[in-house]
């Protein structure tokens, strides 16, 4: 599965779209910063078989899609950019799903690491809770946008490891 070449391009486009989505300068939102506890260890890729790594990436993108598909999200971001963002995420999900199908039967290990998937979900639950507590304020969304950009940027490291595993 030649995931990384198609996928990393889409990842970079996703980052650029997210960068353009900003509505308020982060300089104005310093007080709203929050440590969501990004599960870095789940994206280190050392302990994973390829299929498990792909499933973790898939979960992160799926959760991001869910987060930005809410009514509150639609009211916050530019519609055109949001549509572009959805398109890129959808493309990445398709790439990953196709890749996962190719991995079926290739490895003896399970296709997904349930603990890792749960860890990613809990991370997104913390983000959702933060937004709720902050009443979906512009600065809260700015903090979340920056966090998701950072997580996409860090997940690129896992993609690099997958490329080297090819």
């Amino acid at each position: 599965c030649d995931l990384p070449q198609t996928h990393s391009l889409s990842n970079r486009r996703t980052l650029m779209i997210m960068a353009q989505m900003g509505r308020i300068s982060p300089f104005s939102c310093l007080k709203d910063r929050h440590d969501f506890g990004f599960p870095q260890e789940e994206f280190d890729g050392n302990q994973f078989q390829k299929a498990q790594a792909i499933s973790v990436l898939h979960e992160m993108i799926q959760q991001t899609f869910n987060l930005f598909s809410t009514k509150d999200s639609s009211a916050t971001w530019d519609e055109t950019l949001l549509d572009k963002f959805y398109t890129e995420l959808y493309q990445q999900l398709n790439d990953l799903e196709a890749c996962m199908m190719q991995e079926v039967g290739v490895e003896d290990t399970p296709l997904m690491n349930v603990d890792s998937i749960l860890t990613v979900r809990k991370y997104f639950q913390r983000i959702t809770l933060y937004l709720t507590e902050k009443k979906y304020s512009p600065c809260a969304w700015e903090v979340v946008r920056a966090e998701i950009m950072r997580s996409f940027s860090l997940s690129a490291n896992l993609q690099e490891r997958l490329r080297r595993k090819e």
Epitope: P26, F27, S28, C29, L30, R33, A146
Partner: antibody
Framework: QVQLVQSGAEVKKPGSSVKVSCKAS????????ISWVRQAPGQGLEWMGG????????NYAQKFQGRVTITADESTSTAYMELSSLRSEDTAVYYC??????????????WGQGTLVTVSS | DIQMTQSPSSLSASVGDRVTITCRAS??????LNWYQQKPGKAPKLLIY???SLQSGVPSRFSGSGSGTDFTLTISSLQPEDFATYYC?????????FGQGTKVEIK
Amino acid sequence: QVQLVQSGAEVKKPGSSVKVSCKASGGTFSSYAISWVRQAPGQGLEWMGGIIPIFGTANYAQKFQGRVTITADESTSTAYMELSSLRSEDTAVYYCARHLEYAFPDKFDYWGQGTLVTVSS
Amino acid sequence: DIQMTQSPSSLSASVGDRVTITCRASQSISSYLNWYQQKPGKAPKLLIYFASSLQSGVPSRFSGSGSGTDFTLTISSLQPEDFATYYCQQSYSTPLTFGQGTKVEIK
């Protein structure tokens, strides 16, 4: 390899303006913040303001509001700081400093070499 | 604006000494404090961020601690290259503000 290269030293008359440039390399220019920090001779550090190129709009310290303009040109990966109505107390070394990519602009991770601006009649 | 006050403003020490510099904020800044080292004619260099996290490439003899309003930078065993001026900086809110600096000189 991240690098910030600033324009050369300037000597200016009181009342005039100065524009200092900062050319960045390494990383995606549009998506990280660049701040300007100045240091008067023998004095401490003072944050003037900052910009995230993709936003276009800058944030300024109240002290410099109305006198400083920070801009960024994405096509050349260059940030600019223009200070107007110069007075002798504006004599200082002006630094551009880069914040980490995809992070909040809270710490100055990389610095330019500094540009000495001397205001003298 | 948040005022940052460093003490002492200067100190003399010998190679191998343990050196402590303190920084006090005029209001609580959680752990949003950074430390920089500056040598004459050079740009500052980030040492510690978020009060206690060591910047990549910085020797482990440098450490930071504190939260709220009181913070400390410690150099466990002073080396010849550590003679410089040290600044704290709050990143809790804009304007980002620095302490006035602490000059570490050779005794």
